[in-house]
């Protein structure tokens, strides 16, 4: 899966809920940041995250489609230079410094669910996708034969008016 | 090349049923996110019903809620659309249009050319 | 559900002139925006998506703008051939068409 252009085609800035509506949260603890899966107080202020869209191609022995075999890929970032990284021997999600441009593990195809509600899977472990796993975020192995539905897997994007800090 | 082909449009009296089909070639239908839009005579372009690439998610118009079906055979390549109880305000061309992006209902690019339904007694 | 509302419904210009088209939702869309062209007798074409993004075969005269709420189409040189009814699309929450605006050549 090769990404057509270094530029996204698109930023959106909102912010991250499992389908269950507990927020994803960021915190920098000893000089590094965790991610935890929390349900917030009532006007607490939910974290931001910058969502970047880039198009990718699909491997040709994949796809017949030829010129318009398009994915959307998706770097998550919720604070300057800081991305969301699969570690995929580790079955974890970690906040990283990176410089541009970014490597593949920063890198996830965008499965949307309806609009608003989507899933986010690994690019360099097809099959495996961001999931929530006791009150963290992990990588969950999903069957071809199990519906992508999965309660676990989705998340829900919604807008927020505030200024990312990138 | 993509191609979308609709069939089974019609005319058809108010509250009888009609089966949209569209097949689709050129692309691998199974990745893609499919729609049915359609465009009564001299008017604008109303989206009417979605269905994910799987088939497990399927989405509608208010108005054509509970009388209209999308679904899907991955196997077959085709997308119908199933309308029951067809009232005159659904005449229109309906179009069989294909989603952008592979898992994704973000966009949409590719549309057949149409098939004219005409509910009318 | 998020309205879209096109301006103007008819739009008449000469050709050569910049022709500026526009789109207004009722709710900030994210810049999940398409826009598509018909002629008479045929099916919508993609021009743009994600307010920016030229779709492949599209000639570079078309461009498109945009954030929150507020959405523009424009074609920097119109032509005879781009006589046609426009429409924007959002896909941010839901599936919306605006109504269209139709260019003529004065």
């Known amino acids: 899966m090769s990404i057509t252009g270094i530029s996204p085609i698109t930023e959106y800035l909102a912010s991250l809920s499992t389908y269950n509506d507990q927020s994803i949260t960021f915190a920098l603890e000893d000089e590094s940041y965790e991610i935890y899966v929390e349900d917030l107080k009532k006007d607490e202020k939910k974290d931001k995250v910058l969502l970047s869209y880039y198009e990718s191609q699909h491997p040709s022995n994949e796809s017949g489609d030829g010129v318009d075999g398009k994915m959307l890929m998706v770097t998550l970032s919720p604070t300057k230079d800081f991305w969301l990284h699969a570690n995929n021997k580790e079955h974890s999600v970690e906040l990283h410094k990176s410089e541009k441009p970014l490597p593949d593990q920063a890198f996830f195809v965008l499965h949307n669910m309806h609009s608003n509600s989507v899933s986010f899977e690994s690019k360099t472990d097809p099959g495996v996708f961001i999931g929530v796993k006791d009150n963290h975020l992990a990588l969950i192995k999903v069957d071809s034969s199990e519906n992508l539905s999965t309660e676990n897997i989705l998340f829900k994007l919604s807008e927020t008016h505030h200024h990312h800090h990138h | 090349e993509v191609q979308l082909v609709e069939t089974g449009g019609g005319l058809v009296q108010p509250g009888r049923s009609l089966k949209l089909s569209c097949v689709a070639s050129?692309?691998?239908?199974?990745?893609?996110?499919m729609y049915w839009i359609r465009q009564a005579p001299g008017m604008g372009l109303e989206w009417v019903s979605s269905?994910?690439?799987?088939?497990?998610?399927?989405y509608y118009l208010d108005s054509v809620k509970g009388r209209f079906t999308i679904s899907r055979n991955n196997a077959e390549n085709t997308v119908y659309l199933q309308m029951n109880s067809l009232r005159s305000e659904d005449t229109a061309t309906y179009y069989c249009?294909?989603?952008?992006?592979?898992?994704?209902?973000?966009?949409?690019?590719?549309w057949g050319q149409g098939t004219l339904v005409t509910v009318s007694s | 559900d998020i309205q879209m509302t096109q301006s103007p419904s008819v739009l008449s210009a000469s050709v050569g002139d910049r022709v500026t088209l526009s789109c207004k939702a009722s709710?900030?869309?994210?810049?999940?925006l398409d826009w598509y062209q018909q002629k008479v007798g045929e099916a919508p074409k993609l021009l743009i998506y994600?307010?920016?993004n030229l779709q492949t075969g599209i000639p570079s005269r078309f461009s498109g703008s945009g954030s929150g709420t507020d959405y523009t189409l424009t074609i920097s040189s119109l032509q005879p051939e781009d006589v046609a009814t426009y429409f924007c699309?959002?896909?941010?929450?839901?599936?919306?068409f605006g109504q269209g605006t139709k260019v003529e050549i004065k």
């Open positions: 249009v294909k989603g952008h992006y592979s898992y994704s209902s973000y966009s949409i690019d590719y």
């Open positions: 994600f307010t920016n």
């Open positions: 699309f959002q896909y941010n929450s839901g599936w919306t």
């Open positions: 269905i994910n690439n799987d088939g497990g998610n399927t």
């Open positions: 709710h900030n869309i994210n810049k999940h």
């Open positions: 050129g692309f691998t239908f199974s990745n893609y996110w």
